[in-house]
Amino acid sequence: EVEKTACPSGKKAREIDESLIFYKKWELEACVDAALLATQMDRVNAIPFTYEQLDVLKHKLDELYPQGYPESVIQHLGYLFLKMSPEDIRKWNVTSLETLKALLEVNKGHEMSPQVATLIDRFVKGRGQLDKDTLDTLTAFYPGYLCSLSPEELSSVPPSSIWAVRPQDLDTCDPRQLDVLYPKARLAFQNMNGSEYFVKIQSFLGGAPTEDLKALSQQNVSMDLATFMKLRTDAVLPLTVAEVQKLLGPHVEGLKAEERHRPVRDWILRQRQDDLDTLGLGLQGGIPNGYLVLDLSMQEALS
């Protein structure tokens, strides 16, 4: 083992204070006791250490805690967290939401880094499920967090947590994710009245089946076109012209602008032209009058 340089006389650190910002890296290594550092971690974040100096401090903590830092140290890492690797973080056992918040605050305003992703993964696994408080915290820092989870991971979200979800949190979710979230949302909001229910469920409707869309069409909800365009194509196709008209209310005229885009395009192809004409929007491409419509999906199911 290489012999360590001795601490110069009078430079031994008695506390973590601002005098240390003027220490050279080797002086920090030689003059700062790791145990002292661990007990006064909350001070480190208030002192403008250079990145090189933070490397030294991290090294000292790594030597003191080779199996992973205790939560008392983790909670006060501050900017030192940015120096941690995913491998370092995998050694941690983070159970306090306050610790999670403190570390997310350090990374605030930046993309979710591999370190943060690992931290969240460790935290959620430790808790066993994505509870409301955790989801509240994560979506506050990373609005797209929910949509970064796999359908399997989303299945561990309890319906009660859905109350924490804001519309923008679902912006990047794909249909597979919404398929998992929608039933949870339906359960969570089931005791709300019609208009309030629709406001809450609207963001999740990309996972709604046909029968739920049919039910909504009977409630004068006036769905906007942006929401309609995010519905599952297979859920929209069986809807009648009358049902779509009721579902969209005054927004029905927006179908004209979207007639070449899914799911509107595919839906038009399934409707009788006569029925489409009743909308007075000039929608073209429906089934001509006199043609017989076979429900091939039913035929396949019977054979």
């Epitope: 009078g10 430079k11 204070d17 601002e18 005098s19 003027f22 909350d42 001070r43 208030a46 002192i47 403008p48």
Partner: antibody, heavy 116, light 110 residues
């Protein structure tokens, strides 16, 4: 016990010069940054200058930059402030203080009066 | 005008809690630590709080500091007559490369 003792204040005419000193004891002077802070009569605190342990970088308030110079002699445990081209608005009690980010010890101050 | 903004005065009766605010910006309080200083009439300032919320030894725990975003506050609970003084907040300013103080708050014990 940490002690900071300022000296060198007095009455000086506008355009004149003064050199303040601050003798430090009770701590390892060469390890710590030092600062000068002033307070005009009846007014609030105003930071003037700061100097790290090795005198590497020196920091000044805009109001004194180019006129005041901070220095230190670690062998004598002493901090200095050379003040040139003094103006009436420089009239204040001048304190030396330990550190540059949180002033944990202060001297009792020395009064500088700039008047004709 | 001071870079950090403090109310010019605050008051309370003995035993009450008084809070003093200090508002800065993303170049001073935002990334840097805040300190609070007490100046009794006719004396040099004294460090009361450092690193946002730490108390030097000898400072009663009636004094507490906190920081959130670009603002900080000093709370004095169980106000006493000897707390009548001027209180200043201070922080390093990364843009100015210098230390900045608030204008000071005069605390009066009624």
């Amino acid at each position: 016990e940490v002690q900071l003792l300022e000296s060198g204040g007095g009455l000086v005419q506008p355009g004149g010069s003064l050199r303040l000193s601050c003798a430090a004891s009770g701590f390892t002077f060469s390890n710590y940054a030092m600062s000068w802070v002033r307070q005009a009569p009846g007014k609030g605190l105003e930071w003037v200058s700061g100097i790290p342990p090795d005198s590497g970088s020196k920091y000044y308030a805009d109001s004194v930059r180019g006129r005041f110079t901070v220095s230190r002699d670690n062998s004598k445990n002493t901090l200095y402030l050379q003040m040139n081209s003094l103006r009436a608005e420089d009239t204040a009690v001048y304190y030396c203080a330990k550190n540059m980010l949180s002033f944990d010890y202060w001297g009792q101050g020395t009064l500088v009066t700039v008047s004709s | 005008q001071s870079v950090l903004t403090q109310p010019p005065s605050a008051s309370g009766t003995p035993g009450q809690r008084v809070t003093i605010s200090c508002t800065g910006s993303s170049s001073n309080i935002g990334p840097n630590a805040v300190s609070w200083y007490q100046q009794l009439p006719g004396t040099a300032p004294k460090l009361l709080i450092y690193y946002n919320s730490k108390r030097p030894s000898g400072v009663p725990d009636r004094f507490s500091g906190s920081k959130s975003g670009t603002s900080a506050s000093l709370a004095i609970s169980g106000l006493r007559s000897e707390d009548e003084a001027d209180y200043y907040c201070g922080s390093w300013d990364s843009s100015l490369s210098g230390y900045v103080f608030g204008g000071g708050t005069k605390v009066t014990v009624l």
